[in-house]
């Protein structure tokens, strides 16, 4: 069976204070079944970012719908974006468990915050 | 405002077991990295134990395997479950929250604990 | 494990004057460097974070500088509320988080 693959394309992404960052995310197979997560760092102070299971993310939403079947498209739109929001993005797959269990985590995008234009 | 209230502290023996508690307000606790760090009398800080907001566990060689960190996203509250306790676990206990980016932002007033025979 | 050696021990100062806290890491931590204040009796409090980043609401005399595995905390014009222990913590390395066996600012 051919293991899964969590891809982010973009090692680095830069937005202008304001705007909104795309953080792109796909996985190789639906299989196993269980959540993506995105969080922001790794190690013990990794901050949830999305989690579609549970949760109040209003600055964030899904590009697609990752309720859809089939989908496996779960990247993210951060919107007003702020220099508080730089850091390394990861998406992280789970299987589906009590609790869910991590599977795999993607290599990560660092989002830089660029001073909005005068 | 961010509050972390710790609790649980006291005086025990050598071997006995002892769980702390950390009440957290003013973020969404379940989000976000926890830990406890110690402080020996008249000495430094030492990082003991960190659970992240997904509930993956670390800790420092000199407590694993005695020391349990959890938490209860539902109740916005850390626990150090510590046993096999010694003499040398005698320290101000901290409760801290940690940052994305795997420092400590803010801090608990700490609780004592005492292992003494 | 990654080990922080802060210098000097203690630091005597006058009041108005600048104060140099030294920290000294055993491998490179990448800028990844905070430094936290703590007054007797109280908890410690973070100042800065990513070698140069002050934390929220903290004033601009406390600054920090510094790469690879060298980096200063400087206090310029010291106040009364300034005299404390200073520790250094890398957030590099999460295993283990380790801090500095600090450095005890006094007044001269």
């Known amino acids: 069976e051919e293991e899964l693959q969590v891809i982010q394309p973009e090692k680095s992404v830069s937005v202008a204070a304001g705007d909104s960052a795309t953080l792109n995310c796909t996985v190789s197979s639906l299989i196993p079944v269980g959540p993506i997560q995105w969080f922001r760092g790794a190690g013990p102070g990794r901050e949830l970012i999305y989690n579609l299971k549970e949760g109040h993310f209003p600055r964030v939403t899904a590009v697609s719908d990752p309720t859809k079947r089939n989908n496996m498209d779960f990247s993210i739109r951060i919107s007003n974006i702020t220099p508080a929001d730089a850091g390394t993005y990861y998406c992280v797959k789970f299987r589906k468990g009590s609790p869910d269990v991590e599977l795999k985590s993607g290599a990560g995008t660092e989002l830089s915050v660029r001073a909005k234009p005068s | 405002d961010v509050q972390l209230v710790e609790s649980g502290g006291g005086v025990v023996r050598p071997g006995e077991s002892l769980r702390l508690s950390c009440a957290a307000s003013g973020f969404t606790f379940r989000n976000y990295g926890m830990s406890w760090v110690r402080q020996a009398p008249g000495e430094g800080l030492e990082w003991v134990s960190a659970s992240s907001g997904s509930g993956s566990t670390y800790y420092a060689d000199s407590v694993k395997g005695r020391f349990t960190i959890s938490r209860d996203n539902s109740k916005n509250t850390l626990y150090l479950q510590m046993n096999s306790l010694r003499a040398e676990d005698t320290a101000i206990y901290y409760c801290?929250?940690?940052?994305?980016?795997?420092?400590?932002?803010?801090w608990g007033l700490g609780t004592l604990v005492t292992v003494s025979s | 494990e990654i080990v922080l050696a802060q210098s000097p021990d203690t630091l005597s100062v006058s009041p108005g004057e600048r104060a140099t806290l030294t920290c000294r890491a055993s491998?490179?931590?990448?800028?990844?460097l905070a430094w936290y204040q703590q007054k007797p009796g109280q908890a410690p409090r973070l100042l800065i974070h990513?070698?140069?980043s002050r934390a929220d609401g903290i004033p601009a005399r406390f600054s920090g500088s510094g790469s690879g595995t060298e980096f200063t905390l400087t206090i310029t014009g010291l106040q009364s509320e300034d005299f404390a222990v200073y520790y250094c913590q890398q957030h590099y390395d999460w295993s283990p988080l380790t801090f500095g066996g600090g450095t005890k600012v006094e007044i001269k």
């Open positions: 801290a929250k940690v940052t994305w980016n795997n420092f400590f932002d803010y």
């Open positions: 990513a070698t140069s």
């Open positions: 491998q490179d931590v990448a800028g990844k």
